[in-house]
Interface confidence: medium
Amino acid sequence: FEIALPRESNITVLIKLGTPTLLAKPCYIVISKRHTTMLSIKPGERILFTFSCQSPENHFVIEIQKNIDCMSGPCPFGEVQLQPSTSLLPTLNRTFIWDVKAHKSIGLELQFSIPRLRQFGPGESCPDGVTYSISGRIDATVVRIGTFCSNGTVSRIKMQEGVKMALHLPWFHPRNVSGFSIANRSSIKRLCIIESVFEGEGSATLMSANYPEGFPEDELMTWQFVIPAHLRASVSFLNFNLSNCERKEERVEYYIPGSTTNPEVFKLEDKQPGNMAGNFNLSLQGCDQDAQNPGILRLQFQVLVQHPQNESNKIYVVDLSNERATSLTIEPRPVKQSRKFVPGCFVCLESRTCSTNLTLTSGSKHKISFLCDNLTRLWMNVEKNISCTDHRYCQRKSYSLQVPSDIFHLPVELHDFSWKLLVPKDRLSLVLVPAQKLQQHTHEKPCNTSFSYLVASAIPSQDLYFGSFCPGGSIEQIQVKQNISVTLRTFAPSFRQEASRQGLTVSFIPYFKEEGVFTVTPDTKSKVYLRTPNWDRGLPSLTSVSWNISVPRDQVACLTFFKERTGVVCQTGRAFMIIQEQRTRAEEIFSLDEDALPKPRFHHHSFWVNISNCSPASGKQLDLLFWVTLTPRTVDLT
């Protein structure tokens, strides 16, 4: 190989050992039969050399540094050449370094040709191995602006007082152009300006200077974003730290087109703006740090650019001004993430404060909009507390558990609407009366409606789930002893059409001791399947539940148990079942931990089924499934 550097070129070439490898044989640079492991070539020198091994790329790297002095004379602006040409260099991993020194008053602009640059952070690397490292200067201190790959959005970087640019090319890469040019600009009065151009949908992750170390004290850095007019941009902070400020405040400032309050100033911990149309600037401003305990300011953020959906141009009003103790959350539904670019899905308050989820609270009217490629990616969860504090007052009150119609007007699906019903302990109980009789969801007869009511205890220490109930069954009411949560859960978008079928009324009633009482009026056409609360986990210890089963005058009810035995094993106490005829009060008692369950039996009149649990041994829980069928009476037995 021969490398000749012109005298006025200001280029030095250094060939040196790269990262040591565990290769058995060493390799040397051979110059006039002399073996060495380092070769430095200065301007005006011409050197012939070879390598002592077949694969020098495994041993050596080459650095080509060009010093450009803009202090003493004119600056060579324009497209930057790779000198010496890569074809004249040995096939080693190459790093071209351009070190430009300029006055503080002169701005220097690096312009990158397409495919532009993409910044990457610690622990990442470029797929093709081509890397740009860009640094600036503040007085004598070097500041890392960032490390970049190809195929991104960064089109220009403006700095002042000097630039150090390093282009790393792997030995196998055929590239023979630098891919950037340098231009002079007027002073930018800040550390740097990075321009990021979006041609279409996409995202860019960018970082403050020196990231992940601290941003220089009291400095200002700006990012300029060029966004096609038909697209929308949203900013989200992925990672940030604040330093300890003695004077001034660390902040970000936005120049947003059409905003009447430019610049819009945000704290780093604020929700950042979204749904922005057109170009905008974002600036990071540091502060004067505490000398004793400076801390570090750093920021990594993402700009997401995407098409606005039809929905994002609409404002939706959610009127919770008359609601109390209510919160409505719009959030992403859980999905497996694909690896390709997924446009963001944001919900925006007052069109500007956009985030992946949003909670609206009661007592106000809220205006929201959406910035989302597909609104099925979001769902809504609502929680409402209805508490009674004065048992004398509540005892005559009923409340309608209905989903407010405003919620149906939103373009996202309702997932859960939960009412937490709270009563004074040992003073009142609750009764739920549905607008349409309910069916209990069982494996044998699953619900196939677009929604169900999930009824569970709301007492923290109690693990009691009464079950899932949907309209179209035989359960007329559910009485519960104490605090419960009732959750309307939707399973299909058709819930909007079926919404008229929803409707429960809760009333506060005198206190009773049983955990739950189900009032059932079987339908003559079908089996009514009923099962004990906490199915699969077992009825909680010492819990008692009852079913009040009505039998019409002209019908006979057949009560059938699913199993021959319950399988419960009592550690303490007894588990028993009482079946009582309501008319005669005649009752039969079955020991559930000893006796077999009764064979199918016929009831000509309304009857009670009461199940009371013991304290079961672990793994030997009490679960009971039974069903009731009606058949017409053939003989009048009244």
């Epitope: 008359n322 004065d390 309608s400 405003d406």
Partner: antibody, heavy 126, light 107 residues
Framework: QEQLVESGGGVVQPGRSLRLSCVTS????????MHWVRQAPGKGLEWVAV????????YYADTVKGRFTISRDNSKNTLYLQMNSLRAEDTGVYYC???????????????????WGQGTTITVSS | DILMTQSPSSLSASVGDRVTITCRAS??????LAWYQQKPGKVPKLLIY???TLQSGVPSRFSGSGSGTDFTLTISSLQPEDVATYFC?????????FGPGTKLEIK
């Protein structure tokens, strides 16, 4: 027995002022929002004003805004309506009414009005 | 402001008839609607709140339904004592406007 008794009505000339009172009993007055509603002779009901249980929020119908002031004295269990710059169209029966749910137990701020007074008549005429 | 309209403005029905009165809000009010009954010469009485919940002491022949903008008050079997004017009222937020009323008479 929950009771509301209005007083202070009478005949008054246009432009003059009048103050209505509503004395309550049989319930914890300080826990309830209170309303004034009026009814012109032979006409429907017109909501006039509401005051929250603690007096912090007050809202008025557009027809009386700036002229009428609703207030309450929880220590006296009494609701007031101060009416200034009276007009002929203010003539009617004025009812005080209790908000349908107390401030603590309710899942909503307003419920409708579940207890009404017998009303007091105002005639604005020259 | 939200406007409340009622229809019909008056109606005449026979004892035992099923009677329906409708109330419409010019904008959605969720289920924040109350129905009142005012008998001649008497004070108004709350019948139904939150669109469908019966006030305690009100006969079960009265029922309410609807949500959003359209609401109905139904008397399943008209009784002589039901002669009155019926008003709807929205209370999602102030002003708490009443409907103009529906006068119900017995044929």
């Amino acid at each position: 027995q929950e009771q509301l008794v209005e007083s202070g009505g009478g005949v008054v000339q246009p432009g003059r002022s009048l103050r209505l009172s509503c004395v309550t009993s049989g319930f914890t007055f300080s826990s309830y929002g209170m309303h004034w509603v009026r009814q012109a002779p032979g006409k429907g009901l017109e909501w006039v004003a509401v005051i929250w249980y603690d007096g912090t929020n007050k809202y008025y119908a557009d027809t009386v805004k700036g002229r009428f002031t609703i207030s309450r004295d929880n220590s006296k269990n009494t609701l007031y309506l101060q009416m200034n710059s009276l007009r002929a169209e203010d003539t009617g029966v004025y009812y005080c009414a209790r908000e349908g749910c107390d401030t603590i137990s309710c899942p909503y701020y307003y419920y409708g009005m579940d207890v009404w007074g017998q009303g007091t008549t105002i005639t604005v005429s020259s | 402001d939200i406007l409340m309209t009622q229809s019909p403005s008056s109606l005449s029905a026979s004892v035992g008839d099923r009677v329906t009165i409708t109330c419409r809000a010019s904008q959605g009010i969720n289920y924040y609607l109350a129905w009142y009954q005012q008998k001649p010469g008497k004070v108004p009485k709350l019948l139904i709140y939150t669109a469908s919940t019966l006030q305690s002491g009100v006969p079960s022949r009265f029922s309410g339904s609807g949500s959003g903008t359209d609401f109905t008050l139904t008397i399943s079997s008209l009784q002589p004592e039901d002669v009155a004017t019926y008003f709807c009222q929205k209370y999602n937020s102030a002003p708490f406007t009443f409907g103009p009323g529906t006068k119900l008479e017995i044929k």
